[in-house]
């Protein structure tokens, strides 16, 4: 049986059950190669409390559909008195990066995971030439996820004192020059994740081969190497390589751009101070407030919730968008879709799509940007579920009693973008 998601095959992936202090290793095409789980384990569970390992999915006992992967075992378990076998179940959804498997829940018999990934899309529009896992769990099993930094088009310009060259990088995947052919990037070779531009020439100085690595609690490392054997004539016989060190800052701050810290013989060392390198609990909340123990800021958007069936309305030329954030009030137009953002076609109001659901909510404050994300909306033709990204700006003089109103700014591949100026986005630093 052929591997159902070949682009996920090259790596062993990790997922975590934080509540129970369990680390899962997942290899969907082979075995995880952990001796304690046996030679054919595809899903190996490491219980850090008891320091024990159990195979909860066997690579030989795999069954697959387009969106579901199941690994059975021969180990019996008891579920409501019936004799079942322990198994792992991975549900796949279309995403814009390789993504990460997320632990959902576990019963006595079944370990459930969900994975939003380009590998599950019906069309190849989000697929990279080369992409590597872009997240890590630290020793406390807290997730550090750089997926939000991955550019689907274009690249980051590295801050460098050399006026004659420009070094462009992407994070964890190659630079897509076709979707956004900026004049400088157009000459970059396909597959490169680090492109050096000198005049009208561009050179591949690194491609991703290994996934993201954790080297200290607050430091992540990503390495790119040039795959082709041919040496570049300005590298003094050395093979080019790029090392990017992502540093979680010691306190809240605005985002910075990646900086070149060392260069010799085409070996480039880059340091990027960004809060995306911090653990996810520091950056995100599933509610509309960020003020827990983990975060050192105080943000509360719950006053933006609309009651009594009314919604915010944002005009998007062909469409009207109805928004009801930070609550579970049904939008009237979007009957029973549990939508936080509802897209209605002006010319045919019966054409209604959920552009993100209220129970699929993430509030994120990172590198000075406050963003509310609603995902899991109705599917587009690519298989990607519509989502909405609302970027908030602090405005102490916002209208509508300080609440302000959302403004639609555009759509890219079924992701809808809004900006929202409101006094409730004014971030308060927490007192020490």
């Amino acid at each position: 049986q052929a591997a159902p998601f070949p682009e996920l095959c090259s790596y062993t992936w990790e997922a975590v059950d934080t509540k129970n202090n369990v680390l899962y290793k997942i290899n969907i095409c082979g075995s995880v190669d952990i001796v304690q789980c046996g030679p054919s384990s595809a899903v190996c569970m490491h219980d850090l409390k008891t320091r024990t390992y159990h195979s909860v999915g066997d690579s030989v006992l795999r069954s697959a559909t387009r969106s579901l992967l199941e690994f059975n075992t021969t180990v019996s378990c008891d579920q409501q008195g019936t004799n079942h076998r322990v198994q792992s179940s991975i549900a796949f959804l279309c995403g814009k990066t390789l993504g990460t498997p997320e632990f959902v829940t576990a019963t006595e018999c079944v370990h459930y995971f969900e994975w939003r990934t380009t590998a599950a899309c019906k069309k190849d529009i989000f697929k990279a030439n080369k992409e590597v896992p872009c997240y890590v769990f630290d020793e406390e099993l807290r997730k550090h996820d750089l997926n939000p930094l991955i550019k689907l088009s274009g690249a980051y310009l590295v801050d460098d004192s050399d006026p004659d060259t420009s070094l462009f990088i992407n994070v964890c995947r190659d630079i897509d020059t076709l979707r956004d052919p900026g004049s400088q990037l157009r000459a970059c070779p396909p597959g490169t994740a680090a492109c050096l531009v000198r005049g009208h020439q561009a050179f591949d100085v690194g491609q991703p081969r290994d996934g993201l690595k954790l080297v200290r609690k607050d430091r992540l490392v990503l390495s790119y190497v040039r795959e082709e054997a041919g040496k570049l004539d300005f590298c003094d016989g050395h093979s080019p390589a790029v090392t990017i060190t992502f540093v979680c800052p010691s306190e809240r701050r605005e985002g910075t751009i990646p900086k070149l810290t060392a260069k010799s013989n085409c070996r480039y060392e880059i340091e990027w101070i960004t809060e995306y390198a911090c653990h996810r609990d520091y950056l995100e909340s599933k509610t509309c407030s960020l003020s827990g123990e983990q975060q050192d800021v105080s943000i509360d958007l719950t006053p933006l919730a609309q009651s009594g069936g009314s919604s915010y309305i944002s005009d998007g030329k062909e469409y009207l968008f109805y928004l009801n954030v930070c609550g579970e009030t049904e939008i009237q137009f979007c009957n029973k879709k549990q939508a936080a953002v509802c897209q209605v076609k002006k010319s045919d109001t019966s054409q209604v799509k959920a552009a993100g659901r209220y129970h699929n909510q993430t509030l994120r404050y990172s590198d000075g940007d406050l963003t509310l994300i609603y995902f899991g909306g109705d599917e587009c033709s690519s298989g990607f579920q519509r989502m909405s990204v609302i970027n908030f700006e602090c405005n102490k003089t916002a209208g509508n009693d300080g609440k302000g109103t959302p403004v639609f700014t555009g759509e890219v591949d079924c992701t809808y973008f809004f900006t929202w100026d409101t006094e409730y986005a004014c971030v308060k630093e927490k007192e020490d």
Epitope: Y11, T12, E14, K25, N27, V32, D33, I34, V35, Q36, V136, F137, D138, E139, R209, D210, G211, L212, K213, L214, V215, R216, V221, S223, Y224, V225
Partner: nanobody, 124 residues
């Protein structure tokens, strides 16, 4: 299973060099990430160097950066640690370790296979 056997340790003067070797047998060596750790008497085992299976990622502890190089020869199933400008504080038992798909590269628990160690003593 993977078996690891270190060699190349010994007594050396401060400022000298050593090349430690770690020979692997068993499973396909080229699939494994490799690390070197060391343990001085009465101290915890500490990370020294890491090399990914692909050779694409190397990483060194700050205490040895610039003096140490990790490399591998997949044809010989061997990983090496070249240590230059040795200091008395480099005295320790040096361990070679292997693991599959290592993410936390300085964490001992992520390496599932360990050698017995080779003693390095640096005299002043």
């Amino acid at each position: 299973q993977v078996q690891l056997q270190e060699s190349g340790g010994g007594l050396v003067q401060a400022g000298g060099s050593l090349r430690l070797s770690c020979a692997a047998s068993g499973r396909t060596f080229s699939n494994y990430d490799m690390g070197w750790f060391r343990q001085a008497p009465g101290a915890e085992r500490e990370f020294v160097a890491y090399l990914s299976w692909s050779g694409g990622t190397t990483y060194y502890a700050d205490s040895v950066k610039g003096r140490v190089t990790i490399s591998r020869d997949n044809a010989k199933n061997t990983v090496y640690l070249q240590i230059n400008s040795l200091k008395p504080e480099d005295t320790a038992v040096y361990y070679c370790a292997a693991g599959s798909a290592i993410v936390r590269i300085t964490t001992t628990r992520d390496y599932h296979y360990w050698g017995q160690g080779t003693q390095v003593t640096v005299s002043s």
